[in-house]
């Protein structure tokens, strides 16, 4: 059945209630320099209205503080209002390592990111940090790596490992949840001139992730005790016509090409899904495509296999798909899939359909295919035109969280966290934010607050409190970490 009645119940006490932000551009200098200037000034208020320095007088200055960054102050204010336990944000690789290697490290950028994390911890908000967050508009690579063919060049994976190591070293004492790459399975939108470009870039992204995970596992995990994964774009697929076998096969093929493409090598076999490899090969044999998935060596399979500590999924909607044979040597045509927009469904301005039961089906599919592992939904949300009373977002959050709760309570899926996308909207972009681009709060914040404080949708008489020891432990850890490195 698609929809089942709402359930009453709660998520576990250690559930991560998060909010996701995309790339945080570091502020290059703290924006409150007035506290670091030791001079005394007299303001000529009635004359030329200028400040005149008083010679021979030196004042005590205070050391620079994280909250001198105006941007950080704004984020903290928003996060405090969200009442979340976790904040997921992405670093800007190109800002941290402008040359693409460790020859020029932007220490100020790292200080900025450290401040974001440490100030969040003071509010009881832990960070989930994404190392690399490409978007359709911006590949986000340091220029020299872009110039050297970007993700078509295997050496970009090695450069990523070096960058990841730097971030683990500089931030890993405070950060316990890491995402190496956000939605590598969506870079097919950029590396799209041919299927072989798409699959070649994807291969190097997989290797990049695996190298970073292996480095963390070997060098940093013993002391930092964190967890590392990568976030996959994971929309669910349903047959457009449930009575057509070819549509069912198309739906499963969508999941193989979209999710299993990256999940199978990392979570399971070290190699690409057999179904995907065979489908592409059969099109190749029939002269319909010249695409081919890369052949992996035994060493590459060993490198990739098992390099995830948890499963991280970005889920937004469900797609209705049908089979349509497409000629051409591109990823999109290799799949032989057409999408159907169901106009009867509640949809957002960008045509995202609100189909809550899809997330539960996705979570069950992942467990069935990849075993019983910890799963985080690392981004989930919808665009809503409303600037104040964003009712569509409230409806979306309520219904999707209901389905996640069913997966936890009924299906026994080990769901560990839900991160709503996203904290603040960007100017002239679809409105996904809980806050407007000029930091005005929307009413969905109160709704999310209520779900968080109730830990879900409890029975009327059930307590939303978690045991005191657990809360205290987390707080002690936070304080310890904050004190360890200012």
């Amino acid at each position: 059945k698609e929809s089942t009645p709402d359930v009453q119940g709660q998520f576990p006490c250690d559930f991560s209630w998060g909010v996701t932000e995309s790339v945080l551009k570091p502020e290059s200098v703290a924006s409150s320099p007035q506290f670091s200037d030791p001079h005394l000034y007299v303001w000529n208020a009635t004359g030329n209205r200028l400040l005149h320095r008083v010679e021979g007088v030196r004042l005590k200055t205070r050391p620079a503080q994280c909250t001198d960054f105006v941007n950080i102050k704004k984020q903290l204010e928003m996060l405090a209002r969200m009442k979340v336990t976790h904040y997921r944000f992405a670093l800007d690789w190109a800002s941290v390592l402008p040359t693409g290697n460790l020859s020029a490290v932007n220490r100020q950028a790292l200080r900025y990111y450290r401040c974001v994390v440490s100030e969040g911890l003071k509010l009881g908000i832990s960070a989930m940090v994404t190392l690399y967050y490409p978007t359709h508009a911006h590949l986000g690579l340091p220029e020299p790596l872009l110039h050297a063919d970007g993700w078509l060049n295997p050496s970009t994976a090695e450069a990523f490992q070096a960058y990841a190591g730097l971030c683990f070293q500089e931030l890993g004492d405070l950060v316990k949840l890491w995402i190496t790459i956000n939605e590598p399975n969506r870079l097919s939108d950029i590396y799209n001139r041919s299927g072989n470009d798409t699959y070649g870039a994807a291969h190097n992204l997989l290797v990049a992730h695996a190298l970073a995970w292996r480095l963390y596992d070997r060098q940093f995990r013993p002391s930092q005790r964190g967890a590392v994964s990568l976030s996959l774009h994971a929309d669910w697929a349903e047959p457009a016509n449930p009575y057509a076998d070819s549509h069912w096969r198309a739906a499963e093929r969508f999941l193989q090409f979209e999710i299993a493409w990256f999940a199978e090598p990392l979570f399971k076999t070290g190699d690409y899904p057999a179904a995907m490899r065979e489908y592409i090969a059969s099109k190749h044999r029939r002269g319909l495509s010249s695409s081919a998935l890369p052949r992996l060596t035994e060493a590459e399979r060993r490198l990739l296999k098992g390099t995830v500590d948890f499963c991280a999924l970005n889920h937004f909607t469900t797609r209705f798909v049908m089979h349509e044979q497409l000629a051409g040597s591109r990823y999109d045509s290799d799949r032989d899939i057409q999408f159907l927009q169901d106009i009867t469904r509640l949809s957002s301005p960008t045509r995202l359909a609100v189909i809550p039961w899809g997330v539960r089906k996705l979570l069950r599919w992942v467990r069935r295919n990849y075993g019983d592992m910890d799963i985080y939904i690392t981004a989930s949300g919808i665009d809503d035109q409303a600037l104040e009373d964003d009712r569509l977002r409230k409806y979306y959050l309520g219904k999707y969280l209901q389905e996640v709760l069913k997966a936890y309570l009924i299906d026994k899926v080990r769901i560990k966290g839900y991160y709503a996308f996203k904290l603040a909207e960007e100017k002239s972009k679809p409105r996904f934010g809980f806050f407007t681009s000029d930091f005005k709060a929307k009413s969905s914040i109160q709704f999310y607050n209520k779900v968080i404080s109730s830990r879900g949708f409890p029975f009327e008489n059930s307590s939303s409190r978690c045991s005191q020891t657990q809360e205290n432990t987390e707080c002690t850890v936070c304080l310890f970490l904050v004190q360890k490195k200012p």
Epitope: A137, L139, S194
Partner: antibody
Framework: QVQLQQSGAEVKKPGASVKVSCKAS????????INWVRQAPGQGLEWIGW????????KYNEKFKGKATITRDTSASTAYMELSSLRSEDTAVYFC?????????????WGQGTLVTVSS | DIVMTQSPDSLAVSLGERATINCRAS??????????MHWYQQKPGQPPKLLIY???YLESGVPDRFSGSGSGTDFTLTISSVQAEDVAVYYC?????????FGGGTKLEIK
């Protein structure tokens, strides 16, 4: 290492056509654009157009539409540029150069150039 | 299409002196967070050679006396201390829109 080897000099009469070749080696031919650039005697560089060998798609400078036709033979890892209805002002050195669609799109590798002389 | 205008047309500089070449685009050559502006050097009888890519990044093997700067529409190639082997014609080029026009060129000579 990456190399682009161009065909030899050509002398043609006005109204004739000429086909210049550019053989690529040292990389995957189908993954990078091949561009053609013209340089008339004592003049600057003029971009003519590019071809993506992966699927044969092309883009031309408006000025050279109808004058230049760029093709490729993937089995020979070779790109071609044919110039039709030659006139004396087409006398120039023609270069091929590789660019990367996903990268900076700069021309890091060049052929040695082919001199085409149009004279009656 | 974006038009590239280089200045000056020619430039005479003493050995060891600084040389500056300018390039102006008719509209911004920045997109997707990258600045698609490049500089080339061409010596007589040779194909051009890439010096600077993406406005300010030195191509490998190019001496670090060459540098590039600028953003949006205005760009500069600087040679901090001109050497005899730098005598050449220098071209700017943009690659923002998958069309790749060059500037008119600047001839550098030794005084």
């Amino acid at each position: 290492q990456v190399q682009l080897q161009q065909s030899g000099a050509e002398v043609k009469k006005p109204g004739a056509s000429v086909k210049v070749s550019c053989k690529a080696s040292g990389y995957t031919f189908t993954s990078y654009d091949i561009n053609w650039v013209r340089q008339a005697p004592g003049q600057g560089l003029e971009w003519i157009g590019w071809i993506y060998p992966g699927d044969g798609s092309t883009k031309y400078n408006e000025k050279f539409k109808g004058k230049a036709t760029i093709t490729r033979d993937t089995s020979a890892s070779t790109a071609y540029m044919e110039l039709s209805s030659l006139r004396s002002e087409d006398t120039a050195v023609y270069f091929c150069a590789r660019s990367d669609y996903y990268g900076s799109r700069s021309f890091a590798y060049w052929g040695q150039g082919t001199l085409v002389t149009v004279s009656s | 299409d974006i038009v590239m205008t280089q200045s000056p047309d020619s430039l005479a500089v003493s050995l060891g002196e600084r040389a500056t070449i300018n390039c102006r685009a008719s509209k911004s050559v920045s997109t997707s967070g990258y600045v698609y502006m490049h500089w080339y050097q061409q010596k007589p009888g040779q194909p051009p050679k890439l010096l600077i890519y993406l406005a300010s990044y030195l191509e490998s093997g190019v001496p670090d006396r060459f540098s590039g700067s600028g953003s949006g529409t205005d760009f500069t190639l600087t040679i901090s201390s001109v050497q005899a082997e730098d005598v050449a014609v220098y071209y700017c080029q943009h690659s923002r829109d998958l069309t790749f026009p060059f500037g008119g060129g600047t001839k550098l000579e030794i005084k």
